[in-house]
């Protein structure tokens, strides 16, 4: 672990109650193929324990989905992941919108410091799947 | 390659016959800028050589699509990327579906291990494009 | 840097004269989170400096959009990233179209070499979104 | 085995409406899209619209504005319907499966063929 | 539209000999890379038959001494040896983009 390799696979394990819109994730072998390896959660918010560029990604499919349930909802589904503390480094890092598709999946480097929480905000409606290969949220110390 | 910086990166060779949903790969400087350094192809199938975490990444694009192709038919189009082989440890890794429209592209971490055969199955009746900027599929190694 | 981590996320400045479809980066921590460490800018286009296997990814927004703005153009929306110098190594590397989206996503590996100065082409008259979470360009390099 | 069967008029007066039936056996419309072509001596093979698994029609532009195909996936039917013809319409109509590959757009298996001649 | 012009419009050719047609476009039939350029064999009384599909691929059940090529906008059908029942008229079609078009066609005749 000293090499700074710390690395996180995360599969969805529920949504927030109405007024949050964030996701919350779980990990670790018992769970399947999701993982924990430096980072860790803190109720169900990623946290870094190292300073460095991270490639963070994360991959969000809405449930029971087809290419006119998201035309259906007058507000538009969206998906942002962000800092969200602490709230001096609060800032939105990566941000998708759904429109007329049901998946959405990207991924951005970026510098991150010990003790920043990501969170994964889904704005709308309309609620994501669990099932793990369809939704996943991951994080990879690339380099100081 | 003692460092276990096993890597590939593939581009579509062809579709299989019309009861095989899998696509296909090739590899080599000689067919462009793709490349197998660790893993090998098995039958156009990538087999993974080191055991450790690996980032996969993927992007298909269909052929000669428009905005409406998609929806001329019934049976969605979807792609799934997962081991094939072992059968013992034969699971689905990732899967998007192209709803309305042309390209899907994402990526994710996985534990992958020595003899893991990955596949990639495309449902539905639609060819992909084999141009090499359009669709591609590959791995990185990236810790033990 | 003598390890070879090259490393650099970029974020739009702008878009280039009408007859130029290039996207212009720009990079640095007084930017917000836009970083180059190894690659270096070149009149807002991105140049390589070490040779490798490099991972490169971007995602594009399109400004004040909605899943109608794309399909009310006659001329499909398109990003391509590619090397444009020097001109005996220009090929397109990744190539995505909006169809009836506002982003696109997508990231692949590829060997670049020192002097690769990489372009990103968006085709159509609908502009980026300059919002650093919405549209940014990135390498690393993963291995020589 | 597949076969794509085709009924309709012989003869059609001009500036009246053509009106064929395609009913196939040995697939379901729920997969495969199914042309329609025509044939004269004069302008030989003429494509003219193809109907998709979701009821999405594409069609020739030519001939957009006097065309309609639709079908009832239920009976396995595809109806052509071609209003305002003129002697020039005389020709040989054929449907036709697509391939399996949706976006080949090729025809792996055709009809007999519906013979239409548009005279007074 | 895509016009594609088929020659010869007649070939009269031996038992055993090996049959040329050509099939040009009046465009690339490229995209996505593919080559989306087919052919078809047509007997009297009979709708055509799907024998050559994206320029070299047999559809199934159609003999070996059929044989298609080309690239771009020049394309090709062989036929070696050519046998009695292959006395027929041939097309070749596109499919790159709507509206597809068909050749005029190249008589075989058997002398």
């Known amino acids: 672990e000293s090499l700074g390799w710390d690395i996180a696979e995360l599969q969805l394990n529920h949504t927030g109650p109405q007024q949050d819109p964030r996701l919350y994730w779980q990990g670790g072998p018992a769970l399947g193929r999701s993982f924990l390896r430096g980072p860790e959660l803190d109720k169900g918010q990623l946290r870094i324990r190292r300073d460095g560029i991270y490639m963070v990604h994360i991959q969000v499919t809405l449930a029971i989905c087809s290419s006119t349930s998201t035309s259906r909802h007058h507000h538009p589904t969206t998906l942002a992941v962000g800092i969200c503390s602490p709230a001096s480094r609060s800032i939105s890092l990566l941000r998708l919108s759904f429109h007329q598709g049901c998946t959405i999946a990207s991924q951005r480097l970026t510098p991150l410091a010990r003790g920043d929480t990501l969170c994964t905000n889904l704005t709308g409606t309309l609620l994501p799947s669990r099932n793990t290969d369809e939704t996943f949220f991951g994080v990879q110390w690339v380099r100081p | 390659e003692s460092l276990g910086w096993d890597i590939a990166e593939l581009q579509l060779n062809h579709t299989g016959p019309q009861q095989d949903p899998r696509l296909y790969w090739q590899g080599g400087p000689a067919l462009g800028r793709s490349f197998l350094r660790g893993p090998e192809l098995d039958k156009g199938q990538l087999r993974i050589r080191r055991d450790g975490i690996y980032m996969v990444h993927i992007q298909v694009t269909l052929a000669i699509c428009s905005s409406t192709s998609t929806s001329r038919h019934h049976h969605p189009t979807t792609l799934a990327v997962g081991i094939c082989s072992p059968a013992s440890r034969s699971i689905s890794l990732l899967r998007l579906s192209f709803h309305q429209g042309c390209t899907i592209a994402s990526q994710r971490l996985t534990p992958l291990a020595r003899g893991d055969t990955l596949c990639t199955n495309l449902t539905g009746t639609l060819l992909p494009s084999r141009n090499t900027d359009e669709t591609f599929f590959g791995v990185q190694w990236v810790r033990p | 840097e003598s390890l070879g981590w090259d490393i650099a996320e970029l974020q739009l400045n702008h878009t280039g004269p009408q007859q130029d479809p290039r996207l212009y980066w720009q990079g640095g921590p007084a930017l917000g989170r836009s970083f180059l460490r190894g690659p270096e800018l070149d009149k807002g286009q991105l140049r390589i400096r070490r040779d490798g296997i490099y991972m490169v990814h971007i995602q594009v927004t399109l400004a004040i959009c909605s899943s109608t703005s794309t399909s009310r153009h006659h001329h499909p929306t398109t990003l391509a990233v590619g090397i444009c110098s020097p001109a005996s190594r220009s090929i397109s590397l990744l190539r995505l179209s909006f169809h009836q989206g506002c982003t696109i996503a997508s990231q692949r590996l590829t060997p670049l070499a020192r002097g690769d100065t990489l372009c990103t082409n968006l085709t159509g008259t609908l502009l980026p979104s300059r919002n650093t979470d919405e549209t940014f360009f990135g390498v690393q390099w993963v291995r020589p | 085995q597949v076969q794509l069967k085709q009924s309709g008029p012989g003869l059609v007066q001009p500036s009246q409406k053509l009106s064929i039936t395609c009913t196939v056996s040995?697939?379901?419309?729920?997969?495969?899209?199914v042309h329609w072509i025509r044939q004269s001596p004069v302008k030989g093979l003429e494509w003219l619209g193809v109907?998709?698994?979701?009821?999405?029609?594409d069609y020739n532009a030519a001939f957009i504005s006097r065309l309609n195909i639709t079908k009832d996936n239920s009976k396995s039917q595809i109806f052509f319907k071609m209003n305002s013809l003129q002697t020039n319409d005389t020709a040989m109509y054929y449907c036709?499966?697509?391939?399996?590959?949706?976006?080949?757009?090729?025809?792996?298996?055709w009809g007999q063929g519906t013979s239409v001649t548009v005279s007074s | 539209d895509i016009v594609l012009t088929q020659s010869p419009a007649s070939l009269p050719i031996f038992l055993g000999q090996r049959a040329t047609i050509s099939c040009r476009a009046s465009?690339?039939?490229?995209?996505?890379?593919?080559?989306?350029m087919h052919w078809y064999q047509q007997k009297p009384g009979q709708p055509p038959k799907l024998l050559i599909y994206?320029?070299?691929n047999l559809e199934s059940g159609v003999p070996a001494r059929f044989s298609g090529s080309g690239s771009g906008t020049d394309f090709t059908l062989n036929i070696h040896p050519v046998e009695e029942e292959d006395a027929a008229t041939y097309y070749c079609?596109?499919?790159?983009?709507?509206?597809?078009?068909f050749g005029a066609g190249t008589k075989l005749e058997l002398k």
């Open positions: 036709a499966r697509n391939s399996y590959y949706g976006n080949l757009y090729v025809m792996d298996y």
């Open positions: 040995g697939f379901s419309l729920t997969t495969y899209g």
């Open positions: 109907i998709w698994t979701t009821g999405v029609v």
């Open positions: 465009r690339s039939v490229s995209a996505s890379g593919y080559t989306f």
């Open positions: 994206l320029v070299s």
């Open positions: 079609q596109h499919s790159r983009e709507f509206p597809l078009t």
